[in-house]
């Protein structure tokens, strides 16, 4: 059956959104230490459950800890600067969720690195992509 | 080292046409999905068109019916034909190609300039 136009939208927006976030990690396991150890020092909340658009919510509430974990890298691994990284993934993260969302985010008890956050996130991207195809 | 190489940017007319070619190394590119996007000066990075590793292609509104993406698994290269060029189509064109698995390998490469003079 052919794919609504809708869903294509959906799929376009979750590939940025999975392009970014495969950017940000890239730019990390390029690096060398000491850098990479002191960024996995910061911890991520982690969502309990991530498996419908509502919960980038979650991943929304982290872009700023995201930002600032990025700013401190000050590397030119990540093709464009953290705020202009941060920027894109903000804007389809709300187009994504729809910005009249009231859904309130779950944390898991555990923390993670900024590696299994990244890793947690596109897995649910590509998650849904593959679930729209 | 892995590499992608575009080709196919230059000066063209509005209305006119382009052909972008992005070579890879085979073992970035079969099963993986690939894509195209660009950047003008000032303005957010936009992801123009996809094609999954089993052929399925997706457009950005703003340039679909005008612009086609493809790949040609013997030649292990992606393309995209621009038709109908406009003034706004300006910027540098990126491919990529990324793992739909873990780890998550991401490859792109050094852009190719696209300028629509009117």
């Known amino acids: 059956a052919p794919t609504s136009s809708s869903t294509k939208k959906t799929q376009l927006q979750l590939e940025h959104l999975l392009l970014d976030l495969q950017m940000i990690l890239n730019g990390i396991n390029n690096y060398k230490n000491p850098k990479l150890t002191r960024m996995l020092t910061f911890k991520f909340y982690m969502p309990k459950k991530a498996t419908e658009l509502k919960h980038l919510q979650c991943l929304e509430e982290e872009l700023k800890p995201l930002e600032e974990v990025l700013n401190l890298a000050q590397s030119k691994n990540f093709h464009l600067r953290p705020r202009d990284l941060i920027s894109n993934i903000n804007v389809i993260v709300l187009e994504l969720k729809g910005s009249e969302t009231t859904f309130m985010c779950e944390y898991a008890d555990e923390t993670a690195t900024i590696v299994e956050f990244l890793n947690r996130w596109i897995t649910f991207c590509q998650s849904i992509i593959s679930t729209l195809t | 080292q892995v590499q992608l190489l575009e080709s196919g940017g230059g000066l063209v007319q509005t209305g006119g046409s382009l052909r972008l070619s992005c070579a890879t190394s085979?073992?970035?590119?079969?099963?993986?999905?690939m894509g195209w996007y660009r950047q003008a000066p000032g303005k957010q990075r936009e992801l123009v068109a996809v094609?999954?590793?089993?052929?399925?292609?997706n457009y950005a509104d703003s340039v679909k019916g005008r612009f086609t993406i493809s790949r040609d698994n013997s030649k292990d290269t992606m393309y995209l034909q621009m038709n109908s060029l406009r003034a706004e189509d300006t910027a540098v064109y990126y491919c990529?190609?990324?793992?739909?698995?873990?780890?998550?390998?991401?490859?792109w490469g050094q852009g190719t300039l696209v300028t629509v003079s009117s």
């Open positions: 085979g073992t970035i590119f079969s099963g993986y999905t």
């Open positions: 990529y190609s990324r793992e739909v698995t873990p780890p998550w390998k991401l490859y």
């Open positions: 094609i999954s590793g089993g052929g399925d292609t």
